[in-house]
Amino acid sequence: QERRFQLEGPESLTVQEGLCVLVPCRLPTTLPASYYGYGYWFLEGADVPVATNDPDEEVQEETRGRFHLLWDPRRKNCSLSIRDARRRDNAAYFFRLKSKWMKYGYTSSKLSVRVMALTHRPNISIPGTLESGHPSNLTCSVPWVCEQGTPPIFSWMSAAPTSLGPRTTQSSVLTITPRPQDHSTNLTCQVTFPGAGVTMERTIQLNVSYAPQKVAISIFQGNSAAFKILQNTSSLPVLEGQALRLLCDADGNPPAHLSWFQGFPALNATPISNTGVLELPQVGSAEEGDFTCRAQHPLGSLQISLSLFVHWKPEGRAGGV
């Protein structure tokens, strides 16, 4: 003989795989003080409960340790807590209050639990900017994970030098000391939910700030093929009157500011070009000597120089007296 009561709230609840959900249940107000029963949550159509506070009753193997009856008769609470939700938990459930000593029990209405695919992904947060050679703490967090669930397993993947920092149920810290070559490389945080056997990941591209490591000059002479200078050059022969285009490029992130100077500049010298390009339309005596390209960057500067040696055309000298 059963007395029926209605579960408050929605007729169905949705939970994502690996996460938690609370199925709300309140004992009927008509329940007499003398009714000392045990509470049982059942999967519709099953005889073995998924959760109970009856010490003599077995629960289903599949739900043991994941489904818990939150029993508080004073607050009339008979809610069901589900953690580490699995696809096969997708079903209808009902609550039953029963005592073998009493004639009647109390049975609730049914409530459906819908288990959906996990769509949440981990978040990776970086405090400020990543600077080459300086350690930074990256945090991979899963704030949507419930505290009472089986703690997720965090895995990090990166080519950069790293070490693991502290972790909580919902986050893991990775200390990274990036190098210039780690700029634009991938860093992945992978989170596995062992209770449900689900894995999610997020990948970011590292944006590493670093000072210029290399600076080079490409030289374009007339229509001839360009060639590149990678280190300071003592002397580059150039024919008088020839057009010369000097192109300076440097690495560094963010990009370094490139400028050209004639001679070996002091720190506050005025550049002859504020870009990486220096156009010399007609090389003459004024251009003989040193030209310096400076790559300026907040994290450090680098420069490269080349020395122009002008070859004079024979007829050019004779006609000039």
Epitope: P32, A33, S34, Y35, Y36, N53, P55, D56, W71, D72, P73, R74, S99, K100, W101, M102, K103, Y104
Partner: antibody, heavy 114, light 107 residues
Framework: EVQLVESGGGLVQPGRSLRLSCAAS????????MHWVRQAPGKGLEWVAV????????YYADSVKGRFTISRDNSKNTLYLQMNSLRAEDTAVYYC???????WGKGTTVTVSS | AIRLTQSPSSLSASVGDRVTITCRAS??????LNWYQQKPGKAPKLLIY???SLQSGVPSRFSGSGSGTDFTLTISSLQPEDFATYYC?????????FGPGTKVDIK
């Protein structure tokens, strides 16, 4: 008015038997489990036995197991305690109570003495 | 069997005093604990059921708390009619044992 009234107590010699009754009124007796609880003179309460609403489940304290039998007659709204092989230490006031122990009888005194 | 111990076994108090009685179970009994008051020559009276629920008709100066193994009965302001013996009892599982009792008398 909800009421439980015990009867059947008295003076009995060790080794003899006695049957206690508990008459219920004012509630649906057949829906409730029932208890017997006793209290020796100057001592605390001791739970004795419980019976389910239909008599199919019974449980006893170790001190009375095998000697006492709890039973009920739902048609008569009456609970019983059959006490055999009585001992001096069974001397007590015997109370019947409903399953939640929110309703108690006034008790009946059993004295086991030679 | 689940054993219940009560402390203190007796106490002397004055009218208006706050009185606290504790009951400890030998294993977890969730919230399946009840408190009774008994006066000499009378049947016990249910005060608190399910550890903290006040039985209908019982004055609000009585309150219960706890769950698992440790429970407390508190009388916020002792009245003359509260001098009696108090028992805890577990209904978690058979046998349904009682504590040994705490006698509250006048100081």
């Amino acid at each position: 008015e909800v009421q439980l009234v015990e009867s059947g107590g008295g003076l009995v010699q060790p080794g003899r038997s006695l049957r206690l009754s508990c008459a219920a009124s004012g509630f649906t007796f057949s829906s409730y489990g029932m208890h017997w609880v006793r209290q020796a003179p100057g001592k605390g309460l001791e739970w004795v036995a419980v019976i389910s609403y239909d008599g199919s489940n019974k449980y006893y304290a170790d001190s009375v197991k095998g000697r006492f039998t709890i039973s009920r007659d739902n048609s008569k709204n009456t609970l019983y305690l059959q006490m055999n092989s009585l001992r001096a230490e069974d001397t007590a006031v015997y109370y019947c109570a409903n399953y939640g122990m929110d309703v108690w009888g006034k008790g009946t005194t059993v004295t086991v003495s030679s | 069997a689940i054993r219940l111990t009560q402390s203190p076994s007796s106490l002397s108090a004055s009218v208006g005093d706050r009185v606290t009685i504790t009951c400890r179970a030998s294993q977890s009994i969730s919230s399946y604990l009840n408190w009774y008051q008994q006066k000499p020559g009378k049947a016990p009276k249910l005060l608190i059921y399910a550890a903290s629920s006040l039985q209908s008709g019982v004055p609000s100066r009585f309150s219960g708390s706890g769950s698992g193994t440790d429970f407390t009965l508190t009388i916020s302001s002792l009245q003359p009619e509260d001098f009696a013996t108090y028992y805890c009892q577990q209904s978690y599982g058979t046998p349904f044992t009682f504590g040994p009792g705490t006698k509250v008398d006048i100081k």
